[in-house]
């Protein structure tokens, strides 16, 4: 991937649009959109000031950990869907898009030069990632879209700005 492709706001916007669309589609269904289990996902709440004051390396740790957990959660959701006797038709398409989106975002972050959490010097001192649980596909997609709108967008904004200097 081109090194700074993720710095083009339209790129993230595309994935965000897909996530919002998936959330809206699943908002209407109840029974068939239950995960039938609690899947651990990153807590996407942001205290804006605290986030902005965080070292960029620390932000990177949170983003990588969140991305890894979110990817796991979406793959788990796909497995639940595969085992479902009567899956809600549009779900499969949106799950596939989410998996593809998360893979692309991971690739784009690597291209930007954002080291993965395990190799970051701040990883050892980082507070454990705050998590919540999702019990519906709607909640899963909402966490995905909030993660993109929040921590990921704020982090890439800062990382791209630093790259401009």
């Amino acid at each position: 991937a081109p090194p700074r492709l993720i710095c083009d706001s339209r790129v993230l916007e595309r994935y965000l649009l897909e996530a919002k669309e998936a959330e809206n589609v699943t908002m209407g269904c109840s029974e068939s959109c239950s995960l039938n289990e609690n899947i651990t996902v990153p807590d996407t709440k942001v205290n804006f000031y605290a986030w902005k004051r965080m070292e960029v390396g620390q932000q990177a740790v949170e983003v990588w950990q969140g991305l890894a957990l979110l990817s796991e959660a979406v793959l788990r959701g796909q497995a639940v869907l595969a085992n479902s006797s009567q899956p809600f038709e549009p779900l499969q398409l949106h799950m596939d898009k989410a998996i593809s989106g998360l893979r692309s975002i991971t690739t784009l972050l690597r291209a930007l030069g954002a080291q993965e959490a395990i190799s970051l010097p701040d990883a050892a001192s980082a507070a454990p990632l705050r998590t919540i649980t999702a019990d519906t596909f709607c909640k899963l997609f909402r966490v995905y879209s909030n993660f993109l709108r929040g921590k990921l967008k704020l982090y890439t904004g800062e990382a791209c700005r630093r790259g401009d200097r």
Partner: antibody, heavy 117, light 108 residues
Framework: EVQLVQSGAEVKKPGESLKISCKGS????????IGWVRQMPGKGLEWMGW????????RYSPSFQGQVTISADKSISTAYLQWSSLKASDTAMYYC??????????WGQGTLVTVSS | SYVLTQPPSVSVAPGKTARITCSGD??????AYWYQQKPGQAPVLVIY???KRPSGIPERFSGSNSGNTATLTISRVEAGDEADYYC??????????FGGGTKLTVLG
């Protein structure tokens, strides 16, 4: 002790300009942001914007963008809120507050601005 | 732009529990903050990050936030708690939004 001391009350005519101030003491001024909040007579709180004095980053509320200017002089630990052309509807109490992880955790005493012909 | 809605007024008898609500679209996805403002005074932060209390704020004040609603709970209400209460939140973009405020009246 953290203190934010605001400039005194102002009475102005429509069309006049104005700059009010907020001086921070008892803490590292550049380690926190300053936010500005408007409270019209008998009404609620409205966030106007914030400034990071260290990075000179400013964010305005969409409602106040283009209506006011927020600035800061870190050498004298002071933040400012200014108008180039006041309107009667700008009559209000204006508060500055320190923004930290506990947002708006310390407030100034407020500056009452009255705009009347 | 993001909107937070509060009831204009809440009344409670001394010693009872007051609950003040604040609603906004998926507010539970954001942190909620609460301020107390007494007449003629500047506001005071009483709850931050949904449920944390700044130092000096009594344990009687607590907060919760899920779904579309954040709630400020004041237990064992005292006459001195009579004030206007405002909720607020950070948006992901860095805007700080206040609710319209709720006047808490302590009866008697």
């Amino acid at each position: 002790e953290v203190q934010l001391v605001q400039s005194g009350a102002e009475v102005k005519k429509p069309g006049e300009s104005l700059k009010i101030s907020c001086k921070g003491s008892g803490y590292s001024f550049t380690s926190y942001w300053i936010g500005w909040v408007r409270q019209m007579p008998g009404k609620g709180l409205e966030w106007m914007g914030w400034i990071d004095p260290y990075r000179s980053e400013i964010r305005y509320s969409p409602s106040f963008q283009g209506q006011v200017t927020i600035s800061a002089d870190k050498s004298i630990s002071t933040a400012y809120l200014q108008w180039s052309s006041l309107k009667a509807s700008d009559t209000a109490m204006y508060y500055c507050a320190r923004v930290s992880s506990e947002p708006f955790d310390s407030w100034g005493q407020g500056t009452l601005v009255t705009v009347s012909s | 732009s993001y909107v937070l809605t509060q009831p204009p007024s809440v009344s409670v008898a001394p010693g009872k529990t007051a609950r003040i609500t604040c609603s906004g679209d998926k507010l539970g996805d954001h942190y909620a903050y609460w301020y107390q403002q007494k007449p003629g005074q500047a506001p005071v932060l009483v709850i931050y990050d949904d449920s944390k209390r700044p130092s000096g704020i009594p344990e009687r004040f607590s907060g919760s936030n899920s779904g579309n609603t954040a709630t400020l709970t004041i237990s064992r209400v005292e006459a001195g708690d009579e004030a206007d209460y405002y909720c607020a939140t950070w948006t992901f973009e860095g805007d700080y939004v206040f609710g319209g405020g709720t006047k808490l009246t302590v009866l008697g």
